[in-house]
């Protein structure tokens, strides 16, 4: 039985040109995490593997930084970065847990007045 749950930062907004931290946390399970994949729609952004550490997809190398922890930092945000992001936890023995985050990248002035769920 997969008893675990993934808590995420939920719906977040950030301003164009800025950066944001995407974070997920797996709880309520004894399962052990072997690998975490970060994906945007169907594109792989990054992998954090228990043995091999972090691997950032070449097309995102300039704008994606690993961490903190199993999270992911997106930098130099553009409006095109708006969309769904998924953290996929590969665990033993439960299998796969998936968390969803929706990021909205706003023009600077809009973000200043309407920033919701902003991560400090």
């Amino acid at each position: 039985m997969m008893t675990g749950t993934i808590e995420t930062t939920g719906n977040i907004s950030a301003e164009k040109g800025g950066s944001i931290i995407l974070q997920c946390h797996l709880s309520s399970t004894t399962a052990q995490v072997t690998q975490v994949n970060w994906e945007q729609q169907d594109q792989l952004l990054a992998i954090c593997n228990a043995d091999l550490g972090w691997h950032i997809s070449p097309s995102f190398k300039d704008r994606v930084a690993p961490g903190p922890g199993l999270g992911l930092t997106l930098q130099s945000l553009t409006v095109n970065d708006t969309g769904e992001y998924f953290c996929i936890y590969h665990t033993y023995p439960d299998g796969t847990y998936t968390g969803r985050i929706f990021l909205e990248v706003l023009e600077s002035s809009v973000a200043e007045h309407g920033a919701r769920f902003q991560i400090p």
């Epitope: 004894t30 690998q35 590969h90 665990t91 033993y92 023995p93 439960d94 299998g95």
Partner: antibody, heavy 119, light 109 residues
Amino acid sequence: QVQLVQSGAEVKKPGASVKVSCKASGYTFTNYGMNWVRQAPGQGLEWMGWINTYTGEPTYAQKFQGRVTMTLDTSTSTAYMELSSLRSEDTAVYYCSRGNGYYVGMDYWGQGTLVTVSS
Amino acid sequence: QAVVTQEPSLTVSPGGTVTLTCGSSTGAVTTSNHANWVQQKPGQAFRGLIRGTNGRGSWTPARFSGSLLGGKAALTISGAQPEDEAEYYCALWFSNHWVFGGGTKLTVL
């Protein structure tokens, strides 16, 4: 390369306990679960349980609940399985195997430890 | 507890293809059962060949593949080699425990 090296054969009397060790090398011990599986002579494999090597939390198969204890020494990358109140039916080869969550299952296995229970 | 069934023995000619199956008494095997295939050659340690239904170990030759077939987990060896002669065990995950099949003795003849 990944290796799981187990302790040597044991002969025990009925009612006694046995403690089998499994020393891991070639990877970060606390990143992967550790299972214990046994095989009685001429029989198939039987899963006994697993231990989360990061938190130290064990999960035991119902059949062995109350008789088995799985522990760790993370400083030496060693997992232990202790089985108490031994009976002749516990005569078997005991294996440790690494639990991998990327494609869930057991990838590496120890060489096995023969435990003979005889009066 | 669920019972996991395998063919007790199978024979394949060198270069031939053979499929070993793994069924569950509880119904169709699904990806949630994380089917595993483990190989044991005489006098050698067990080796995990396939995990999570179709995931190969880094040492698993490409001729071994895992799948779901007709409600069972399956291990197919395409182009069998003499060194594939061994005992093969499948294991299925049932919510909180693994159950192993009785094993298939594969002869390459």
